[in-house]
Interface confidence: medium
């Protein structure tokens, strides 16, 4: 079943390569388990950036080696992606799945265009 997912259209990464955005889903039911996946679309290729499962009311945790971190509050997930470089500029899509209890719901956002600008190297001082 389909579910609406909202996310900002554009986000600019910080000079340290960190970008944060909110992914909000319109939950049609009372889910106890939610899975959030961040997908990156660039040059018509879609790749999975990170994924996490969380129980409602508990923290959102990604794998230890993930470039993503996040927190959840109600039907909102606050996502942070770190370690970004200019080549990582692209459309980052939030996919939300209500895993349990049935019925299963799937929602895919329109994507957040994240722009990453590599910082200019500091000039050498004589």
């Amino acid at each position: 079943k389909a579910m609406h997912v909202a996310q900002p259209a554009v986000v600019l990464a910080s000079s340290r390569g960190i970008a944060s955005f909110v992914c909000e889903y319109a939950s049609p039911g009372k889910a106890t388990e939610v899975r959030v996946t961040v997908l990156r679309q660039a040059d018509s290729q879609v790749t999975e950036v990170c994924a996490a499962t969380y129980m409602m009311g508990n923290e959102l945790t990604f794998l230890d080696d993930s470039i993503c971190t996040g927190t959840s509050s109600g039907n909102q997930v606050n996502l942070t992606i770190q370690g970004l470089r200019a080549m990582d500029t692209g459309l980052y899509i939030c996919k939300v799945e209500l895993m349990y209890p049935p019925p299963y719901y799937l929602g895919i956002g329109n994507g957040t265009q994240i722009y990453v600008i590599d910082p200019e190297p500091c000039p050498d001082s004589d």
Epitope: E33, A52, T53, Y54, M55, N58, T61, L63, M99, Y100
Partner: antibody, heavy 120, light 107 residues
Framework: QLQLQESGGGVVRPGGSLRLSCTVS??????????WGWIRQPPGKGLEWIGN???????YYNPSLKSRVTISVDTSKNQFSLKLSSVTAADTAVYYC????????????WGQGTLVTVSS | DIQLTQSPSFLSAFVGDRVTITCRAS??????LAWYQQKPGKAPKLLIY???TLQSGVPSRFSGSGSGTEFTLTISSLQPEDFATYYC?????????FGQGTKLEIK
Amino acid sequence: QLQLQESGGGVVRPGGSLRLSCTVSGGSISSSSYYWGWIRQPPGKGLEWIGNIYYSGNTYYNPSLKSRVTISVDTSKNQFSLKLSSVTAADTAVYYCARRRIQLWSFDYWGQGTLVTVSS
Amino acid sequence: DIQLTQSPSFLSAFVGDRVTITCRASQGISRYLAWYQQKPGKAPKLLIYTASTLQSGVPSRFSGSGSGTEFTLTISSLQPEDFATYYCQQLNSYPYTFGQGTKLEIK
């Protein structure tokens, strides 16, 4: 080292209920990073997932068994339990308890299993 | 429910052989697939999770690959202790399901 130990196996009469417990040692059942689950294996056959429980009490059941299954957790005893009612010979199996690390999408620790035989 | 079909169901090989076991899902499961090894009278042991990540303590001769609907478990050089039954399991959606198993025997 985490260990899971099932107890309560044996012979159960058809139409009765089986009750199994799994005691967790070497780690806390109250961690938010894990599910605790039950899986069974009929003699000479494959594996079947029965259900999971989260420390908060949220349960997740296989629809094929849902009407007969209850999984509960007792955090004070660091254990979780399985009750399966209205059993038949088809429920004869080795029952395993296991831990599922939420973010790894797999069962990484298993008990040694306990055999339940349904027979009159 | 998602069905997992393993092939072959039975495999006979020599020590030192390279063997591959395939697991096909009836619908896409991304990379939410695990592989287990089970020896007679013992509980299953986790080998691979999220399709290709080696569980800590598992020898590097084991490897996994695949995404979507087709997955493989490869043992690069069979050792005597590798003769066992292997199961794949999907954890993409409830109910979790297992493949029927592949029995690997010594030739």
